[in-house]
Interface confidence: medium
Amino acid sequence: MQLSQVSDLLTQEQANLTHQKKKLEGQISARQQAEEASQESENELKEMIETLARKLNEKSKEQMELHHQNLNLQETLKRVANCSAPCPQDWIWHGENCYLFSSGSFNWEKSQEKCLSLDAKLLKINSTADLDFIQQAISYSSFPFWMGLSRRNPSYPWLWEDGSPLMPHLFRVRGAVSQTYPSGTCAYIQRGAVYAENCILAAFSICQKKANLRAQ
């Protein structure tokens, strides 16, 4: 074998080895990438599992809370079942009182009779909270509502049905305050303000009675 042939063989072998080396390097790189990808997806899976576990934990907490709420509601319902309703049907309950907004238009005396027949009196406003509630309740109505406030003539004080005087800080009576009417002057509430008017005129009315707040 000649020296030139050996040289050729070595060159060929070197080329082969270089090719093999590159091939191996490519395989190693591919494997590394695959391992990295595998690591990444493993991390993602771990994160997913952690998130699901966290959510599951939250849901079970929520479920526990709902369960407690349910128990509380059942307790409340048991208590309510042992109580009678604070107000009769169609009456509105607010604070210590029940209110009924009349479905007919009558003069003050007739309105008073209607309330009495329902074991109630015409509206009496005792506090600013009462006034706020009534104002809110009638804010969408165009109609005047008789209340249980009247006076014989302008020289007399405004009195509620039970004989107690109107507290001046609650509201000011507007309108025909200086007029004298044979049937007396009565007060009505409309759109949140209180007005004096001839008791003989027809208007809606508001009846009021104590709410039943005693547990049986």
């Epitope: 165009s142 109609f143 005047p144 303000a193």
Partner: antibody, heavy 115, light 107 residues
Amino acid sequence: QVQLVQSGAEVKKPGASVKVSCKASGYTFTDYEVHWVRQAPGQGLEWMGAIHPGSGGAAYVQKFQGRVTMTRDTSTSTAYMELSSLRSDDTAVYYCARWLPMDYWGQGTLVTVSS
Amino acid sequence: DIQMTQSPSSVSASVGDRVTITCRASQGINNWLVWYQQKPGKAPKLLIYAASSLQSGVPSRFSGSGSGADYTLTISSLQPEDFATYYCQQYLITPYTFGQGTKLEIK
């Protein structure tokens, strides 16, 4: 959609009565007041009164007291306004309107009072 | 009864103008005030209620303001369809009274 449809034009003699109808649709008739407003030719708007269809209770302007009657028929969701003892100055277009305030109006009914 | 006085009774303006109409009540009405627009041969249309609340579907160029006994309707930039008669109405206490109207005409 909410609609108020009024009856057609009327020609009446002085002293007679007229009854205008207002048929409501598209909402719960008993939940909203129906108001009546009139407008004489070339003049402004004049509020006449209102009825609460749920209860039938009504409120009228003093000027029309004794001459006007507002009624309703809940079975047909119709409100009525009757004006009696008609005079020539009652010639006007009469409108009904749903209140909250008056967000929907009828098309108007022209009532002409002439001898 | 509460008297409502509108001013001016008529106003001439051009498209794009800003127009202000005022309404004065004979007593404080606590913002219980509405504004209507009426075109010839048509029923009035509600624009503003409770003094400053814009009725749904009404363009935002219309605005209402005021308190006590004095109220204002403003049209920020007049459009051709805005030429009409405008009315205020108090609804504090019956009888609900209207202003006499303001006619808005093209200059």
